[in-house]
Interface confidence: low
């Protein structure tokens, strides 16, 4: 492979808003490899070097007028200039997330269990996710995978409740985010389809097996009750 | 006080690589890049060049002094070479799996200097090229670097997929495995107890109960046609 | 502002050495970056590039005359020297120095030049 | 040693766009920047673009540089009979300058 020995110089011109642009930072800072060693700060007004490496450049660029006064400004011509011209799609940007409920293992009830609440392609970061059952915030044995970042301005996290559920119990996963009017709500219910369906087959049939047996033996014993008197001749052979 | 946003312009230059780059990022996201070979000016996403411009020329200049500074910092340090950081690699689905549904993969690269980085997508172990995309290096508040790649795919049991990477940090080229966990069904033994019972059950009721009834049913009418004595 | 100027013998002898002085001012050269070169122009031709010193007394050579230049720099007399040896009348040229500023790759800004003609 | 190759020289009537080619290899032009400067008769250079397209303050825009892949070329556009001088093309690796032949602008009429 190539083994060459490498070198790199990184630069990064930070503007750091607070409250909108009533109060803006800016540092004009440079590295050599991962290593700082001179910045401007708006909040000190000179060049400081950071380590020893970047005294020469520091000493040079506070000696030029011009720079500084053009590096003091940046707060307003650089930072206020720049959050102006994207505000619109990045300050503003919003993107409804997409809320999916799910079991992380498909256990039988009553077994200890992982119900993920997926919350994806929404913008901006800021999310809160919370698990109720039955209408009580579950507070203990939430575990989240922490806001990850998509790298195409979408983000996604994943919220898991250890639960062990019982049939008939409801879980609901919330969001709240700036996206939204109102918060979010998905249900899980604790029970599968295709167990209620077979829960209500087996019911259902058991059931309308009593009630056809019930009327038949009602019926047959009905008759045999009404005409009793009427009968001893009637196995005359 | 926590700042509400942060916007950086990174630019960087790698020597001996020669290569560059030129940066704007909001909060952690890349707003735009310059590709330095066309000149151009590059909108992470396209709905962004809509409401803003950026002129290619001036990140060029500034990549001219990067380069000059690089040069300068490279002989103050006495030669001093950058330190190899191997990157963190995870792979990841855009949404919830479902099979053929479309779905993106994700595979993540970060925390690695230098910016260089070899990335190969692979299906059941052969290369996929088509429809794949990537992000530039993105940077990291502890100056190491991110990246992105991305795998379009439609979910199957039978497909196995591997992001492969390969750094000068790293000994060996790194596989992050990725396959479709199929949910086995719930084995639903209560319900199927009583769904079996119930519906034998019901079914034995129903003819036994018929029966009775049709029984009975004779029963009455034998005994209306004989009449009183 | 920046000003330079190269001062030395108009006329040196075959086989001498030719010794010149560069003195500077509006900038110094203990700063990061910096450095001063020459460059001389033979008459009525192209100019090329002889040596550079730079803040921090690093330097370098043209490669087809390493072997006959020396460059040395005085901070405190903002002055630059640069000797050549053995010179020919092919060496009979304008010899300009010029600064490099912290942003190195182009020369910023010349001296008048000083001629100096290798006779007998 | 003249490492850069440049034509010998160009002409061009007042008002004219005249542009002047330099020709290096990968070592320098095509891992470099490139510099152009402009010398009157009997003064010394003077710097006109640096950064292969950047002018120092007080050069008219009507100076412009450009460079492609180990090419570089300096246009000037609306000619001026002052215009008329010997312009240098130079760039240069980690420790070596070097510069082009020279090209004699003749601005004609």
């Known amino acids: 492979g190539d083994t060459r020995p490498r070198f790199l110089e990184q630069v990064k011109h930070e503007c750091h808003f607070f409250n909108g642009t009533e109060r803006v930072r800016f540092l004009d800072r440079y590295f050599y490899h991962q290593e700082e060693y001179v910045r401007f700060d708006s909040d000190v007004g000179e060049y400081r070097a950071v380590t020893e490496l970047g005294r020469p450049d520091a000493e040079y660029w506070n000696s030029q007028k011009d720079l500084l006064e053009q590096k003091r400004a940046a707060v307003d011509t650089y930072c206020r200039h720049n959050y102006g011209v994207g505000e619109s799609f990045t300050v503003q940007r919003r993107v409804y997330p997409e809320v999916t409920v799910y079991p992380a293992k498909t256990q039988p009830l009553q077994h200890h269990n992982l119900l993920v609440c997926s919350v994806n392609g929404f913008y901006p970061g800021s999310i809160e996710v919370r698990w109720f059952r039955n209408g009580q915030e579950e507070k203990t044995g939430v575990v989240s995978t922490g806001l990850i970042q998509n790298g195409d301005w979408t983000f996604q996290t994943l919220v898991m409740l250890e639960t062990v559920p019982r049939s008939g119990e409801v879980y609901t996963c919330q969001v709240e985010h700036p996206s939204l009017t109102s918060p979010l709500t998905v249900e899980w219910r604790a029970r599968s389809e295709s167990a209620q369906s077979k829960m209500l087959s087996g019911v259902g049939g058991f059931v309308l097996g009593l009630l056809f047996l019930g009327a038949g033996l009602f019926i047959y014993f009905r008759n045999q009750k009404g005409h009793s008197g009427l009968q001893p001749t009637g196995f005359l052979s | 006080i926590k700042e509400e946003h942060v916007i950086i312009q990174a630019e960087f230059y790698l020597n001996p690589d020669q290569s560059g780059e030129f940066m704007f990022d909001f909060d952690g996201d890349e707003i735009f890049h310059v590709d330095m070979a066309k000149k151009e000016t590059v909108w992470r996403l396209e709905e962004f060049g809509r409401f803003a411009s950026f002129e290619a020329q001036g990140a060029l200049a500034n990549i001219a002094v990067d380069k000059a500074n690089l040069e300068i910092m490279t002989k103050r340090s006495n030669y001093t070479p950058i330190t190899n950081v191997p990157p963190e690699v995870t792979v990841l689905t855009n949404s919830p799996v479902e099979l053929r549904e479309p779905n993106v993969l994700i595979c993540f690269i970060d925390k690695f200097t230098p910016p260089v980085v070899n990335v190969t997508w692979l299906r059941n172990g052969k290369p996929v090229t088509t429809g794949v995309s990537e992000t530039v290096f993105l940077p990291r508040e502890d100056h190491l670097f991110r990246k992105f790649h991305y795998l379009p795919f439609l979910p199957s049991t039978e497909d196995v997929y591997d992001c492969r990477v390969e750094h000068w940090g790293l000994d060996e080229p790194l596989l992050k495995h990725w396959e479709f966990d199929a949910p086995s069904p719930l084995p639903e033994t209560t319900e199927n107890v009583v769904c079996a019972l119930g519906l034998t059950v019901g079914l034995v009721g129903i003819i036994i109960g018929t029966i009775f009834i049709i029984k009975g049913v004779r029963k009455s009418n034998a005994a209306e046609r004989r009449g009183p004595l | 502002q920046v000003e330079l100027k190269e001062s030395g013998p108009a006329l040196v002898k075959p086989t001498q050495t030719l010794t010149l002085t560069c003195t500077f001012s509006?900038?110094?050269?203990?700063?990061?970056?910096?450095?001063v070169g020459w460059i001389r122009q033979p008459p009525g031709k192209a100019l090329e590039w002889l040596a550079l010193?730079?803040?921090?007394?690093?330097?370098y050579y043209s490669t087809s005359l390493k072997t006959r230049l020396t460059i040395s720099k005085d901070t405190s007399k903002n002055q630059v020297v640069l000797t050549m040896t053995n010179m020919d009348p092919v060496d009979t040229a304008t010899y300009y120095c010029?600064?490099?500023?912290?942003?190195?790759?182009?020369?910023?800004?010349w001296g008048q030049g000083t001629l100096v003609t290798v006779s007998s | 040693d003249i490492v850069l190759t440049q034509p010998p020289s160009v002409s061009g009537a007042p008002g004219q766009r005249v542009t002047i080619s330099c020709s290096g290899s990968?070592?320098?032009?095509?891992?470099?920047?490139v510099t152009w400067y402009q010398q009157l008769p009997g003064t010394a250079p003077k710097l006109l673009i640096y950064d292969n397209n950047q002018r120092p303050s007080g050069v008219p825009d009507r100076f412009s540089g450009s460079k492609s892949g180990t090419s570089a070329s300096l246009a000037i556009t609306g000619l001026q009979s002052e215009d008329e001088a010997d312009y240098y093309c130079?760039?240069?690796?980690?420790?070596?300058?070097?510069f082009g032949g020279g090209t004699k602008l003749t601005v004609l009429g």
């Open positions: 010029a600064r490099s500023p912290r942003y190195r790759g182009a020369f910023d800004y």
């Open positions: 509006g900038f110094s050269l203990s700063t990061s970056g910096v450095g």
């Open positions: 990968e070592s320098n032009i095509g891992a470099n920047y």
């Open positions: 010193i730079d803040w921090d007394d690093d330097k």
């Open positions: 130079q760039s240069y690796d980690y420790d070596h300058y070097v």
